[in-house]
């Protein structure tokens, strides 16, 4: 065991090439010098060495970098990127998106491993927010990146970084994280037309309050019933006939067949059944006429 | 290959509890947001609760204060603690992993309660 602890006369490793995958493990530590390792690591990945002997390059690199890689080094790690741990991950310094996208490129594909949640973590730290290059970044290789983060996770994103989200980003969201997106969206999509507008904010109304949907029935958005029955309960029923009647425009039929699901069903109970006579669509379950309509909301608010 | 398996649904009284698990395997569960969903006859889907990678929890309103999620990592499992059940939540109980890549159910798991 002692002697293979000395490098071979003349397998002193000159460059990093193809004649190394030819070298028994060993050989590899005795021959290849870290800090050439280090300087030519882009020529790794065109290598197709073992896992193996992929272990003895890392273990060459974490000796020469015990307090973790320098961004020079990790740009260029390649498929030596699925050899590192989480740990490894923590004492790196990430700071160039050319570097993350690199390294997510690597695991492309497949589910998030631990290894990339800690880089992407460590990444989106180092940024201080999740800022749009950055999100766009990370929806491209993980649609559903957005939906997997807690509202108060979201809570730390700007803005300005909506304009990187597209519909199909939002579909596994859950309310709570709608709540957060939707005021960051209205705040993002302001300056944009009322058409306009609407195609951008749709698909964040999930979260959107009663107001801002008695706004939107005055500007003829036609929403669909689709959108219609994601939005809030609570924000849907205090909407009168005649303002649902304007979000929807001709999607209003499509009430009839949603007349049992929530939110259609719990805004029917609330509407009277005269009003909702009006919309020609045999909606029954509405308020008869003649009873009185308490506000028990208001009556605990005075009370 | 990626499995969700629920399990723990029963038949309850009303104001009896259940406790309804959920067992993943094939992606990285600590990275995921976990979620219940349920489903009442002739209903549409609707969501109950979430656990997220990073510790918090959400509730819809009409279970909060009875229902309590929560996750464990080391097993990749997801729990709902239902107590003070009403008939009204009867329903199929779906458990959803929402990885960073794409969301994946389970096939369900019945809570019928009677009164």
């Known amino acids: 065991e002692v002697e293979k602890t000395a490098c071979p006369s003349g397998k002193k490793a000159r460059e990093i090439d193809e004649s190394l995958i030819f070298y028994k493990k060993w050989e590899l530590e005795a021959c290849v010098d870290a800090a050439l390792l280090a300087t030519q690591m882009d020529r790794v990945n065109a290598i197709p060495f073992t896992y193996e002997q992929l272990d003895v390059l890392k273990h060459k690199l974490d000796e020469l970098y015990p307090q973790g890689y320098p961004e020079s080094v990790i740009q260029h790690l390649g498929y030596l990127f699925l050899k590192m741990s989480p740990e490894d991950i923590r004492k790196w310094n990430v700071t160039s998106l050319e570097t993350l996208k690199a390294l997510l490129e690597v695991n492309k594909g497949h589910e998030m491993s631990p290894q990339v949640a800690t880089l992407i973590d460590r990444f989106v730290k180092g940024r201080g927010q999740l800022d749009k290059d950055t999100l766009d970044t990370l929806t491209a290789f993980y649609p559903g990146y957005l939906c997997s983060l807690s509202p108060e996770e979201l809570s730390s994103v700007p803005p300005s970084s909506i304009w990187a989200v597209r519909p199909q980003d939002l579909d596994t969201c859950d309310p709570r994280q709608l709540d957060v997106l939707y005021p960051k969206a209205r705040l993002a999509f302001q300056n944009m037309n009322g058409s306009e507008y609407f195609v951008k904010i749709q698909s964040f109304l999930g979260g959107a309050p009663t107001e801002d949907l008695k706004a939107l029935s005055q500007q003829n958005v036609s929403m669909d019933l689709a959108t219609f029955m994601k939005l809030r309960t609570d924000a849907v029923l205090p909407l009168t006939v005649a303002e649902v009647q304007k979000l929807l425009g001709p999607h209003v039929e499509g009430l009839k067949a949603e007349e049992r699901h929530r939110p259609v069903r719990d805004w029917i109970l609330r509407q009277r059944q005269d009003d909702l006579d009006t919309l020609g669509l045999g909606l029954q379950g509405g308020i008869p006429n003649g009873y009185l309509v308490l506000d028990l909301s208001m009556q605990e608010a005075l009370s | 290959e990626v499995q969700v398996v629920e399990s723990g649904g029963g038949l309850v009284q009303a104001g009896g509890s259940l406790r309804l698990s959920c067992v993943a395997s094939?992606?990285?569960?600590?990275?995921?947001?976990m979620r219940w969903y349920r489903q009442a006859p002739g209903k549409q889907r609707e969501w109950v609760a979430s656990a997220f990678s990073d510790g918090n929890l959400h509730y819809e309103d009409f279970v909060k204060g009875r229902f309590t999620i929560s996750r464990d990592d080391a097993k990749n499992t997801l729990y709902l603690q239902m107590d003070s059940l009403k008939p009204e939540d009867t329903a199929v109980y779906y458990c959803?992993?929402?990885?960073?890549?794409?969301?994946?159910w389970g096939q369900g798991t019945q809570v019928t309660v009677s009164s």
């Open positions: 094939g992606f990285t569960f600590s990275v995921a947001a």
């Open positions: 959803n992993a929402g990885t960073p890549s794409r969301a994946y």
